[in-house]
Amino acid sequence: GMEVRWCATSDPEQHKCGNMSEAFREAGIQPSLLCVRGTSADHCVQLIAAQEADAITLDGGAIYEAGKEHGLKPVVGEVYDQEVGTSYYAVAVVRRSSHVTIDTLKGVKSCHTGINRTVGWNVPVGYLVESGRLSVMGCDVLKAVSDYFGGSCVPGAGETSYSESLCRLCRGDSSGEGVCDKSPLERYYDYSGAFRCLAEGAGDVAFVKHSTVLENTDGKTLPSWGQALLSQDFELLCRDGSRADVTEWRQCHLARVPAHAVVVRADTDGGLIFRLLNEGQRLFSHEGSSFQMFSSEAYGQKDLLFKDSTSELVPIATQTYEAWLGHEYLHAMKGLLCDPNRLPPYLRWCVLSTPEIQKCGDMAVAFRRQRLKPEIQCVSAKSPQHCMERIQAEQVDAVTLSGEDIYTAGKTYGLVPAAGEHYAPEDSSNSYYVVAVVRRDSSHAFTLDELRGKRSCHAGFGSPAGWDVPVGALIQRGFIRPKDCDVLTAVSEFFNASCVPVNNPKNYPSSLCALCVGDEQGRNKCVGNSQERYYGYRGAFRCLVENAGDVAFVRHTTVFDNTNGHNSEPWAAELRSEDYELLCPNGARAEVSQFAACNLAQIPPHAVMVRPDTNIFTVYGLLDKAQDLFGDDHNKNGFKMFDSSNYHGQDLLFKDATVRAVPVGEKTTYRGWLGLDYVAALEGMSSQQC
């Protein structure tokens, strides 16, 4: 029939819905409104998806779930009198005198409006998880938060297993009653209570609304606790690690919180729903009307069908849940929503060799002994590519991959990074910049765009910084144009002459060996090992130094390692780093110390890759808890995550150089993890794979 079926989640809501339906009918509003009884917002969402109901108003978190799990969309938004359009902002407040930042929250005392409340819990906790600051194992968010902060007041957390920590700062009412209640009995409950918790020194940070500080300071508050408070004594924590004045909430917040919205199926004519409700609000939203759309007083409840503070309903232009929620809130929800019942009991790790199987088996046992979740299972495959296939086919869940394999995993198999490896800052062999080094020469200076016809020095054929990245970058930029996918010939024709040591010189263009010198006796010319004096990154730099070549493609550390007395070999002993420069992609030249801004690409760290439907926060949560126990190579807990010496191998499961597993943060895609320059170089090379 021609009706819109509204889903009610309780008896009072059903009652109000019936009255709204009747009021609309009497006013001749078309189409007619019918009421369907659901048991909860979740149930209503299921009824709508199954076409047994058509519409319901939801909060941000529920809109996220409804959109992600059922493809529902928001079509009508609520606007509130006191707020900023269709939203408000979640902020983190600290005392101006403190030194806390968003990056130093671990261990501080925290004040929250209440458990599972939007700005007091969902947004800050979700944000901390999503940004990688807070790791959660096995979906146990409460445990993670209780371990993270140095005591909290989270009204309503008294019934949880972590009440000791989460209710530690709560104080109840003046007679000590109602400690940690999710009600006004707890003095630190709600927006003003959480702020009071901070103001009275119980906590170091309060998670509240953008207007909370200004509403409770500068003489605006009646209770005695707030009489003397000044807004200038408080500051906001910004996402970038800075702090700001409490009036700067538009720029400095954790997330913009979307208003509640009416959601419907993805193919529903949202305009029709808005016209129906608009007719209704035109007649039934003011004081004297027979039915009050935005009041729940008559039913002894609050916020039935719509929030009572709604001043009007507006149509939503871009009808997608992502657009309505906004990226900040969306990201926070991604971090927060983890359903323990849907968490797989196992994480199946892909292994590629007998030693790796052995190490993985030991890892599984070690993790199980420490009750880490999910449990590890080891599944073998023949190659990294085979791992990718098996992960895509849902036979395996995770594997650690190198840069080139991450590219394939993302591009061909749709996998995403869940965690990354982090190496020591001084470790340049595992994550480094690829640079083009030239002699500082004012009379014959040339740029990256003028390399044609120059002499080039390369570490070796197939080496990342010596071949793959520079050649890929030059192909991608259109300087080298291979015919019939013949990259070798194209490179040999692009440069006047080169030294590109190689192991299998069959059909190898002679000009790619023209600059090579072999060993001291002049033998082993152009071989792919250290017998060729111009082999490797040190050799490629030597090729430049000895004026055999005009440009050397090396790592960013190569110049430093071989100048200023760092290499005592005769060819390097007198070299000074300031005699060399880098060629930048923008056509400029730069000092060798400027490698971070002037490079062809950064070789990315290895990353753990998973299917896009895998909860990456549970993967990182597991690895983070595991590395606390097993990450130190000298730990006494019976297993070493980042050491393979016990298994007669190297770089098993993780690179041995790994210092920590790290969250991916905002680098949630293979392109994000690899970086645009590295991807461009790989795309240059892969465009030639015919």
Partner: antibody, heavy 119, light 107 residues
Framework: ELKLVESGGDLVKPGGSLKLSCAAS????????MSWVRQTPEKRLEWVAS???????FYPDSVKGRFTMSRDHARNILYLQMNSLRSEDTAMYYC?????????????WGQGTSVTVSS | DIQMTQSPVSLSASVGETVTITCRAS??????LAWYQQKQGKSPQLLVY???TLAEGVPSRFSGSGSGTQFSLKINSLQPEDFGTYYC?????????FGAGTKLELK
């Protein structure tokens, strides 16, 4: 009885224009989304345009900027103005009603009107 | 754009048999899938929407199933009037796309 009757199909030269009409009856036209769907000579079905009950239009990239869909609520008529016609626009054009509340699932199809674009 | 891949392209069966036609979406479309039947020289008719809800007047021998990206239409005990071409279509959003069709012929 629900009826959708298309008209206006014809033989037209590439680059030419044509306006299709669809007369709707037997249902509350104002409250339903409507669409045009075409069927190519190879029998492939292709979505051409949709219009919500309130008049918001949606088009695929292949016809965007060339075709314009509109509706006349007073006369219960749907229109499709087709400009810059190409040979690949040759097809049987169906006027289709969206299901109740739905923009894109289609519960009633007219008999179609034939459009041939050829020099 | 979401691609809809239907299989098989054609199918021969006898009256009384049970047949299944499948449709795969190139990305998740939840349950937003419709099936249409078209007989020679006639307009298409809606059979199933929302992946498994039968349209008004459609016999119960037709049933739709699936969600996400994989869907199927099953016809139990084929009747003579069931022969024709079947199309799937997603109704998740724009652009709307159809499968290439499955021609069901009498063996």
């Amino acid at each position: 009885e629900l009826k959708l009757v298309e008209s206006g199909g014809d033989l037209v030269k590439p680059g030419g224009s044509l306006k299709l009409s669809c007369a709707a009856s037997g249902f509350s036209f104002n409250n339903y989304a409507m669409s045009w769907v075409r069927q190519t000579p190879e029998k492939r079905l292709e979505w051409v345009a949709s219009i919500s009950s309130g008049g918001t239009t949606f088009y695929p990239d292949s016809v965007k900027g060339r075709f314009t869909m509109s509706r006349d609520h007073a006369r219960n008529i749907l229109y499709l103005q087709m400009n810059s016609l190409r040979s690949e626009d040759t097809a049987m054009y169906y006027c289709v009603r969206g299901q109740w509340l739905s923009l894109y699932s289609m519960d009633y199809w007219g008999q179609g009107t034939s459009v041939t674009v050829s020099s | 754009d979401i691609q809809m891949t239907q299989s098989p392209v054609s199918l021969s069966a006898s009256v009384g048999e049970t047949v299944t036609i499948t449709c795969r979406a190139s990305e998740i479309i939840y349950s937003y899938l419709a099936w249409y039947q078209q007989k020679q020289g006639k307009s298409p008719q809606l059979l199933v929407y929302n992946a498994k809800t039968l349209a008004e007047g459609v016999p119960s021998r037709f049933s739709g199933s699936g969600s996400g990206t994989q869907f199927s239409l099953k016809i139990n005990s084929l009747q003579p009037e069931d022969f024709g071409t079947y199309y799937c279509q997603h109704h998740y959003g724009v652009p709307v796309t159809f499968g290439a069709g499955t021609k069901l012929e009498l063996k």
